[in-house]
Interface confidence: low
């Protein structure tokens, strides 16, 4: 067969859908790979062809669009399952072609089973709510295009396994779920089940997302440097190892880039000749406040190194701070037999 621009397997679009539910999957060619949309392609005489490779098979097969009740169908650039079955799992390819042009891309589709509490191997989107921040809402995701606006679905919200009703701070409002005041105890998985009729049948769409309650911007502060501080002096003899931790607390800030760095005599460690290593570790609180620790290490410190200025810097969207470490050379203890004895007039 003639050459086709093959975009390969688009693993970035690892599509997961629930078993026994409708699924509509757009051909990724028009969303990510081509500069024109389906309507333009169609009016230019290009045809969209679908085929698939079953799980654990190498054979490419056409998709059977003649199943009872039109279980699988195609509409424009969308492949429809009404509903999915477990053995629909596989790699799907959409190919756009005419006699002179061909372009195709494959993508994995996984049909996933869920239990009665909506637990499944599905990768869940995360929605962040600010702690104690007033009313915030989440919206039932990815339900557009499944039914016309004239159809009024019923929506039921669940937290974990439990239907949300008479909760004191979580209120279902159709496609939205309102949190009157988000608390850490609101962390968890929330599921909306959308039920709608179509051609005498009833379909259910299940959408689960993870709510993570994070630090509120109203409580956010500039970075706080816990170490170095004024209480600790790093007193070393030449030849010893110098270890100085820089520990910085960052309030959670959406999309903020938290940075910690050391300067030695005003320069970045990479820009000076001494043998310095810096190791970083990061930990997070339950509200995603961040503690970063960068340990500056000089294996064998010299007396010159002990005269240098070591400053820890930190920056977030809330501001920039810096703190110098107190470093000094240890004064050697007197050797009794020589120095001290001399002091007593011994000869």
């Amino acid at each position: 067969s003639e050459r086709c621009d093959d975009w390969g397997l688009d693993t970035m679009r690892q599509i997961q859908v629930f078993e026994d539910e409708p699924a509509r999957i757009k051909c990724p060619l028009f969303e990510h790979f081509l500069k024109f949309n389906y309507s333009t392609a169609h009016s230019a005489g290009l045809t969209l062809i679908w085929y698939w490779t079953r799980q654990d098979r190498d054979l490419e097969e056409p998709i059977n669009f003649r199943l009872p009740e039109n279980r699988i169908s195609k509409e424009k650039d969308v492949l429809w399952f009404r509903p999915t079955l477990l053995n629909d799992t596989g790699n799907y390819t959409c190919m756009l072609r005419n006699t002179t042009y061909c372009s195709k891309v494959a993508f994995p589709l996984e049909v996933v089973q869920k239990d009665s509490c909506f637990n499944s191997p599905m990768k869940l989107p995360v929605h962040k709510l600010y702690i104690e921040y007033g009313i915030q809402r989440i919206t039932c995701p990815n339900v557009d295009g499944y039914f016309p606006s004239s159809v009024k679905p019923t929506i039921t919200w669940y937290m974990g396994c439990y239907k949300i009703q008479n909760f004191n701070n979580v209120i279902p409002e159709g496609m939205n779920l309102s949190f009157l005041i988000a608390l850490i105890s609101n962390n968890g998985n929330y599921t909306c089940v959308v039920t709608y009729p179509e051609n005498g049948r009833t379909f259910h769409l299940t959408r689960t997302l993870t709510v993570k309650v994070v630090g509120s911007p109203k409580n956010a502060v500039p970075p706080v440097i816990h170490s170095p501080n004024d209480h600790v002096v790093y007193e070393k003899e030449p030849g010893e190892e110098l270890l100085i931790p820089c520990t910085v607390y960052f309030s959670f800030l959406m999309d903020s880039r938290n940075e910690v760095w050391w300067t030695i005599d005003g320069k970045k460690p990479d820009d000076i000749t001494i043998d310095v290593t810096i190791n970083e570790s990061i930990s997070h609180s339950r509200t995603e406040d961040e503690t970063r620790t960068q340990i500056l290490s000089i294996k064998k410190v010299t007396s010159e190194d002990l005269k240098r200025s070591y400053v820890c810097h930190a920056r977030s969207a809330k501001g920039e701070v810096a703190k110098a470490a107190k470093v000094k050379q240890k004064v050697p203890a007197p050797r009794y037999t020589v120095e001290l004895a001399c002091g007593f007039g011994a000869t």
Epitope: I131, M159, G160, S283, S285, T287, D289
Partner: antibody, heavy 119, light 108 residues
Framework: QVQLLQSGAEVKKPGSSVKVSCKAS????????IDWVRQAPGQGLEWMGG????????NSAQNFQGRITITADKSTNTAYMELSSLRSEDTAVYYC????????????WGQGTMVTVFS | EIVLTQSPGTLSLSPGERATLSCRAS???????LAWFQQRPGQAPRLLIY???RRATGIPDRFSGSGSGTDFTLTISRLEPEDFAVYYC?????????FGGGTKVEIK
């Protein structure tokens, strides 16, 4: 003001089970975690496990797994801790404690239930 | 598991004196998730400090908490007669939740 009221003292034989209850009054029960902590005579505090009633899923310390069952009844605002295969070293005061709203620390404690295990 | 070591085991002080209690963790504790409790004889523990340094509701300001990483301190600026009790630190950032062995503050 939320209060946690625990069931009364128990005397048990080795090998038996004990079920201690913890009833919440005066506030929201189901969205906060209820944890269980025990204290042997003259000893420190030991976390056993907890439950968020709204989920019903429990989380317990490894040294109690297989012996502890933590449940909650949302209709009565009551959490339960059942410890099986009792031995003499399980003699302790058992406390329930509420995991706070924003602090997540144990901000409200029950009065404690003394469980004595001896033959 | 994070092991919390409290020191000293016993602190003998007089009313009006300053008490400094230490809690050292075997691994770094998320700085937001360390609490201090007071326990008087025959009573349930009472939350004093959470999130390292935040006073719980109704706790007088003579109690203060500080620290980060692995070293934490509870300070009672001026001991009142009712402050003589056992104090426990607790980390609640990672499972299993763990308590320190306690520091007894007794009257000298």
């Amino acid at each position: 003001q939320v209060q946690l009221l625990q069931s009364g003292a128990e005397v048990k034989k080795p090998g038996s089970s004990v079920k201690v209850s913890c009833k919440a009054s005066g506030g929201t029960f189901s969205i906060y975690a209820i944890d269980w902590v025990r204290q042997a005579p003259g000893q420190g505090l030991e976390w056993m496990g907890g439950i968020i009633p709204i989920f019903g899923t429990e989380n317990s310390a490894q040294n109690f797994q297989g012996r502890i069952t933590i449940t909650a009844d949302k209709s009565t605002n009551t959490a339960y801790m059942e410890l099986s295969s009792l031995r003499s070293e399980d003699t302790a005061v058992y406390y329930c404690a509420r995991n706070g709203a924003t602090s997540d620390a144990f901000d409200i404690w029950g009065q404690g239930t003394m469980v004595t295990v001896f033959s | 598991e994070i092991v919390l070591t409290q020191s000293p085991g016993t602190l003998s002080l007089s009313p009006g004196e300053r008490a400094t209690l230490s809690c050292r963790a075997s691994l770094s504790v998320s700085s937001n998730y360390l609490a201090w409790f007071q326990q008087r004889p025959g009573q349930a523990p009472r939350l004093l400090i959470y999130g390292v340094s935040r006073r719980a509701t109704g706790i007088p300001d003579r109690f203060s908490g500080s620290g980060s990483g692995t070293d934490f301190t509870l300070t009672i600026s001026r001991l009142e007669p009712e402050d003589f009790a056992v104090y426990y630190c607790q980390q609640y950032g990672s499972s299993p939740l763990t308590f320190g062995g306690g520091t007894k503050v007794e009257i000298k």
